[in-house]
């Protein structure tokens, strides 16, 4: 059976994006199906479609088609962002140049080389001819549109308006002239889908007929859209995988450009001292290798024969012997005059980051510009144009595309904690970058800490030394156990979440720890028909120096009698100082012989500067910090409670407040605990919760 | 943890180990590769992250080139030893995606020895 | 990035107490700093992650501080089976690692 051949490599993918027809009169045609190569297929052969199929969209959610009988550019259509669609459109309809004889040529140009409008295909005046478009099916003989529909040798034509010339060929440019790069094409982001032999190139983001390594979402900066032409590797020019299974890639021919120019954005900083990044832009004029071996000149084949010649890589600086880095490997390199040694890289010219002291921000970062593109699990970022669908979803206003360049690590949202991106991996859909805040930084985060402006109540409702024991409505109340036993205490906010503490968590391996919840007693005793015992599925550490972990629970708990949620404060609200509090916990109670009870500890929110005076001035309280005293001499957290909670209430309604950390004593007399301040942290807490994703009950 | 691959090279001759691991999937952790010459410190080269992104110290650019061959091990190729580079070379793991946001070096291999000598 | 590590070598007796110390060139992210300890011949075992957070199976006598650029490994109460050599190893932005040098122990 002859292999049906896979169209996808003619259409033009626009992620995210569908079309909404806005003329009634446009018909569309849908079907299920399982995949986009399917939807391509059928509108390349148009079967059975009532209608010249020209783009399609798949809806990935619902494992549909889509098919139009118009694009993006035409009259009454208009393009939406759409997350789970994925619009393909027919290039031969968008281009406007034409392959070869351009036989192919469906464009909208519809004016002579001599400047004659043309004369629609289906009209015999002034000329009478047999082009008519039922004889010539599938040659897209529309309107007055130039076309080629024998292949004749001129290219595309059509007859004229005027009675005196009859036909006439139309100026359509042949694409490899409209096509120009610059250097050797590394920056190239032009249109052009075909080998200088005529292969058709693959699609970058299909593994057929060649398996390779350059997929889309791992080189986001590569310009790896549909199947044109690219030289991500530094090669001599811009190349592709091929259609052909016998031939795996080829150059593409695309000119020089004629102003041999290069945009600024896609020039290396060129530095002469030190290397930046990959050392791309390093001119300056070391010559040997890291272990002093003379470089061999470039322009020179021996004693070693290679294709990185100046000629080969304009723009890359190739002059005498020096260091240089022309193919994007990791550091500037040069073949050396050891014949026996190839190639050596020049390892001993300095980092320029190294040089110049490390990347900051000041405030929150939201005016950070730096380049840093990289995640604090070292994840690199995705492009920001690809996540905006997911930005819109958090923030309520238009973020300013101007600073959303590439994929470099921004604050859109103005999060509280710095610069972040998107990573692309489902597990960390996004993460903080590690740039620190500017040292000696004062820019507050959050305004007005000691006023209480902001309200912390949205809606309703600790180890602790001396603390009476308690059962009213605390089904928030979770027991961390590490290697079947209690080790701390913790916070439900959502089904499927809870907030606890760093110090939590001695291991990485998430088999060691579970979440008990609806319990009383912390062994579990009496409290089998109330308990919920769940796996732990990651967790996701506070920002810098928050000391918080949110925990996703393998599956949602079931909220009822015996467990339920708590609520978070407003970002940055204050709360009045001598409001009343609880701290709860399983922890040590300086009890000999402890029940194992849940206790609770009563305490009072204490303003930071009273705060730190009964701390005898040792303490300087941030706005990331929250205090709270006891009534009681010596009742508070201690271990066994960290993670636990700080609950306060404030018009009716219980939240928690404060996360119970180590560091400043057990429940040592007039000495008030200092807890983190969740209110600081709410907004990273939330946005977790809305991008993470979790499992459904 | 497992490291292969150390043996006796001469100057010049590329060598590669490799670190597999079982037990735990690559794509969702980023594998560091640390070297301790003979009565020596440690030394960190490079890492291999979650989603295959590498890095490298300052002086391991160029000399070595950390890839992620499939989601169970990860390579380190030494591409012109000298003596200098006879060290017992470690795979680690820095990063796991199921705890986000707490890099450091939790489990380790045995090591496996590379000696360069003419 | 460099990490210096002091004292090279350091020396006391058992029940007694040992200070490391481990300052950076440059400020180390997020206080990403661990402690690790290895025994000739073995592989290095982590101790304490974040500066201070203490790792599996690590008695608490082992106790990190510090924030920055400075921080410091504290054994009190020195057991014989503490002899061994300590690094630190910090974490920068651009995600880079590097190691101290080391410290001996020697448990008398």
């Known amino acids: 059976q002859r292999k049906r051949r896979n169209t996808i490599h003619e259409f033009k993918k626009s992620a995210k994006t569908t079309l909404i027809k806005i003329d009634p009169a446009l018909k569309i045609k849908t079907k299920k199906v399982n995949t986009a190569d399917q939807c391509a297929n059928r509108c390349t052969r148009n079967k059975g479609l009532p209608f010249t199929c020209k783009a399609f969209v798949f809806d990935k959610a619902r494992k549909q088609c889509l098919w139009f009988p118009f694009n993006s550019m035409s009259s009454g259509v208009k393009k939406e962002f759409g997350h789970e669609f994925d619009l393909y459109e027919n290039k031969d309809y968008i281009r406007n140049c034409i392959i070869g004889k351009g036989r192919s040529y469906k464009g909208t140009v519809s004016i002579t080389k001599s400047g004659i409008k043309c004369q629609p295909w289906s009209s015999m005046i002034p000329h009478e001819h047999s082009f008519l478009p039922s004889s010539y099916r599938g040659k897209d003989l529309q309107e007055n549109y130039c076309r080629n529909p024998r292949g004749e040798e001129g290219g595309p034509w059509c007859f004229t308006s005027n009675p005196e010339v009859r036909y006439e060929v139309c100026d359509i440019p042949q694409c490899s002239e409209v096509e120009c790069m610059t250097c050797n094409g590394e920056s190239y982001r032009g249109l052009m889908d075909h080998t200088e032999s005529g292969k058709i190139c693959q699609r970058w983001d299909h593994q057929t007929p060649h398996r390779h390594k350059f997929l889309p979402e791992r080189y986001p900066d590569k310009g790896f859209d549909d199947n044109y032409c690219r030289n991500p590797d530094g090669q001599p020019r811009p190349w592709c995988y091929t259609l052909d299974p016998h031939t795996r890639w080829e150059y593409c021919a695309i000119k020089t450009c004629a102003d041999n120019t290069m945009n600024d954005t896609d020039v290396p900083l060129e530095t002469t001292e030190c290397i930046q990044g990959q050392g791309e832009g390093y001119r300056g004029t070391v010559n040997t290798i890291w272990n002093g071996i003379p470089c061999q000149r470039w322009d020179s084949q021996y004693p070693h024969e290679h294709d990185m010649t100046p000629e080969n890589f304009k723009c890359k600086d190739l002059r005498e012997n020096y260091c240089r880095n022309p193919d994007g490997s990791e550091s500037p390199w040069c073949f050396t005059t050891d014949p026996n040694i190839r190639v050596g890289y020049c390892s001993q010219i300095p980092n320029c980051d190294m040089s110049h002291g490390q990347d900051c921000y000041r405030g929150n970062g939201k005016n950070y510009m730096g380049n840093l593109s990289q995640t604090r699990s070292g994840l690199t970022c995705s492009m920001w144009d690809k996540n905006m669908e997911d930005l819109h979803r958090h923030i309520f206003w238009e973020p300013d595309a101007s600073k959303l360049n590439e994929n470099y690590c921004r604050n859109p949202d103005d999060d509280a904690h710095g610069p972040w991106c998107y990573t692309g991996n489902p597990l960390i859909p996004w993460d903080y970058c590690p740039i620190s805040r500017c040292e000696g930084d004062t820019t507050p985060t959050i305004v007005n800490l000691d006023h209480p402006v902001i309200s912390c109540a949205k809606t309703k409702q600790l180890r602790v030394v001396n603390g009476i024991p308690t059962r009213t409505n605390i089904g928030w109340m979770v027991s961390l156990r590490y290697r079947n036993k209690h080790i701390c205490g913790g916070s439900l906010i959502k089904e499927s979440w809870v907030l606890t503490a760093r110090q939590c968590f001695p291991s990485r391996d998430l088999k060691d720890y579970e979440a008990w919840l609806g319990i009383h007693d912390v062994h579990g005793r009496g409290d089998e028909k109330c308990k919920q015992v769940l796996n732990v599925s990651q967790l996701v550490y506070g920002p810098e120096g928050s000391d918080l972990v949110l925990m996703k629970l393998a599956r949602p708990a079931v909220l009822d009698d015996f467990v339920s949620t708590i609520d978070l404060p407003n970002y940055g609200c204050t709360i009045p100082e001598k409001t009343s509090c609880s701290v709860y916990g399983w922890g040590y109670t300086g009890l000999i012989n402890y029940d194992g009870l849940l206790r609770v500890a009563h305490l009072y929110i204490m303003g930071n500067e009273k705060c730190s005076q009964h701390h005898r001035g040792k303490v300087t309280l941030n706005e990331s910090e929250i205090c709270a005293g006891a009534e009681k001499i010596g009742s508070g957290p201690c271990e066994g409670d960290y993670g636990g909670p700080l609950v306060c209430e404030q018009h009716k309604m219980r939240m928690v407040l404060g996360v119970i950390v180590p560091g400043r004593g057990c429940a040592i007399p007039n000495r008030p605990g200092i807890f983190v301040r969740v209110a600081y942290y709410a907004k990273w807490i939330h946005k977790i919760i809305l991008t993470y994703k979790v499992p459904q009950s | 943890v497992e490291e292969s691959g150390g043996r006796l090279v001469t100057p010049g001759t590329p060598l590669t180990l490799t670190c597999t691991v079982s037990?735990?999937?690559?794509?969702?952790?980023?594998m560091s590769w640390v070297r301790q010459a003979p009565g020596e410190g440690l030394e960190w080269i490079g890492a291999s992250s979650i989603d295959g992104t590498t890095y490298y110290t300052n002086w391991a650019k160029g000399r070595f080139t950390i890839s992620k061959t499939s989601s169970t091990t990860v390579d380190l190729k030494i591409t012109s030893p000298t003596t200098e580079d006879t060290a017992t070379y470690f795979c680690?793991?820095?990063?796991?995606?199921?705890?986000?946001?707490?890099?450091?070096?939790?489990?380790w291999g045995q090591g496996t020895l590379v000696t360069v000598s003419s | 990035q460099v990490l210096t590590q002091t004292p090279p070598s350091v020396s006391a007796v058992v029940g007694g107490t040992v200070t490391i110390n481990c300052q950076s060139s440059?400020?180390?992210?997020?206080?990403?700093l661990s402690w690790y300890q290895q025994k000739p011949g073995q592989t290095p075992k982590p101790l304490i992650y974040?500066?201070?957070s203490l790792a599996s199976g690590v008695p608490s006598r082992f106790k990190g501080s510090g924030s920055g650029t400075q921080f410091t490994l504290t054994i009190s109460d020195l057991e014989c089976d503490d002899a061994a050599s300590y690094y630190c190893?910090?974490?920068?932005?651009?995600?880079?690692?590097?190691f101290g040098g080391g410290t001996e122990v020697v448990v008398k």
């Open positions: 974040a500066a201070s």
């Open positions: 190893a910090g974490y920068y932005s651009g995600h880079i690692y590097s």
């Open positions: 680690t793991r820095g990063e796991y995606a199921g705890v986000v946001g707490s890099n450091y070096f939790d489990l």
């Open positions: 440059q400020r180390i992210y997020s206080n990403w």
């Open positions: 037990g735990i999937d690559l794509n969702s952790n980023g």
